[in-house]
Interface confidence: low
């Protein structure tokens, strides 16, 4: 009976050993599968995150497009109204003009002498820009960049005058130090009778026939 028990015990030990090995193998297999599943989960997760990011970006882009469309529709209907009303009243800015504080501004990308720039603005039912405040100055500078740009200020007929009749003496001024100086040393004949923004935004007087960029301005009528 003892020998039988010994055999049974040996058999049990063997079975247990086999079971342990088998269990370890299964655990290892499960662990490998788990890692694989984990990796796949991470992959799916990152794909989902990317898709979500893309969707958010698409949504933002779509919102921008919708806003732009709404703005364009408003602008177009306003243009149509202005067109039907023979352009006598303007409650919105023409296309490609920028609205700021009740005025519309157009920034040239080409260059012309002051007189030609002035004529151009007049043909657009506007005038060369008249700068009346520090805020307007900053707004213009943000849109122009560091470029010499004509403004609607000249002393060709005597004292300095704004083209729209705004009072020069009591109004906003932003000359560079020692300007205007009516400099004759340029050798182009005469002095300097037209004002422009210099690269840092302060004003200088220069020879009117120099070709610089320019800005046109027109006031918006109050909407009823």
């Amino acid at each position: 009976q003892n020998s039988q028990l010994r055999e049974d015990l040996l058999a049990l030990r063997q079975n247990f050993s086999n079971l342990t090995v088998s269990t370890e193998d299964q655990v290892k297999a499960l662990s490998t599968q788990g890692s694989s599943v984990g990796r796949k989960m991470k992959l799916v997760e990152s794909k989902l995150e990317k898709q979500q990011k893309d969707l958010t970006e698409d949504h933002s882009s779509l919102l921008l497009h919708v806003k732009q469309l709404v703005s364009d529709v408003r602008s177009l209907s306003c243009q149509m109204a202005a067109f039907r009303g023979n352009g006598s009243e303007r409650t919105c800015c023409p296309i490609n003009w920028v609205e700021y504080e009740g005025s519309c501004y157009w920034f040239s990308s080409s260059v012309r002498p002051w007189t030609e720039a002035d004529k151009y603005c007049q043909l657009e039912n506007a005038h060369l820009v008249v700068v009346t405040s520090r805020d307007e100055q900053n707004f213009l500078q943000r849109h122009m960049g560091p470029l010499n740009t004509w403004i609607g200020l000249t002393d060709q007929n005597g004292p300095w005058k704004w083209v729209d009749g705004t009072d020069y003496e009591t109004g906003f001024q932003n000359w560079r130090p020692e300007q205007p100086d009516n400099w004759y040393g340029h050798g182009l004949g005469g002095g300097e009778d037209c004002a422009h923004f210099t690269t840092d935004g302060r004003w200088n007087d220069d020879v009117c026939r120099r070709p610089y960029r320019w800005v046109c301005e027109t006031k918006l009528d109050k909407a009823n």
């Epitope: 100055q137 900053n138 943000r142 960049g145 560091p146 560079r176 690269t199 840092d200 935004g201 302060r202």
Partner: nanobody, 121 residues
Framework: EVQLLESGGGLVQPGGSLRLSCAAS????????MGWVRQAPGKGLEWVSD????????YYADSVKGRFTISRDNSKNTLYLQMNSLRAEDTAVYYC??????????????WGQGTLVTVSS
């Protein structure tokens, strides 16, 4: 990367002269107006002079007019400040500065490390 490196500072007697230089790199030098600004010990920044991109137009603070001359050599990307008839009150750290062409009430966007000018007997 914009870099402005001043040199030429030092100790000088009243009535003496110095020439400051500023070597510029990292941007198209001849596209921008440049200037000099100084800071005396315990004082705020004081605009000294600036010069247009071409070098045609130059501007000076009243305190240095007739004594200082700003100039530039666009072929060497270098800005200069010739200082004559120096006075004790000219003692300061002198900074070379690039004008940003954007906001008139803060016209400088890059500054050098500065060079110290001491006027003393």
């Amino acid at each position: 990367e914009v870099q402005l490196l001043e040199s030429g500072g030092g100790l000088v007697q009243p009535g003496g002269s110095l020439r400051l230089s500023c070597a510029a790199s990292g941007f198209t030098f001849n596209d921008y107006d440049m200037g000099w600004v100084r800071q005396a010990p315990g004082k705020g920044l004081e605009w000294v002079s600036d010069i247009s991109s071409t070098g045609r137009a130059t501007y000076y603070a009243d305190s240095v007019k007739g004594r200082f001359t700003i100039s530039r050599d666009n072929s060497k990307n270098t800005l200069y400040l010739q200082m004559n008839s120096l006075r004790a009150e000219d003692t300061a750290v002198y900074y070379c500065a690039k004008m940003n062409g954007k906001y008139y009430d803060d016209p400088f966007d890059y500054w050098g490390q500065g060079t110290l000018v001491t006027v003393s007997s």
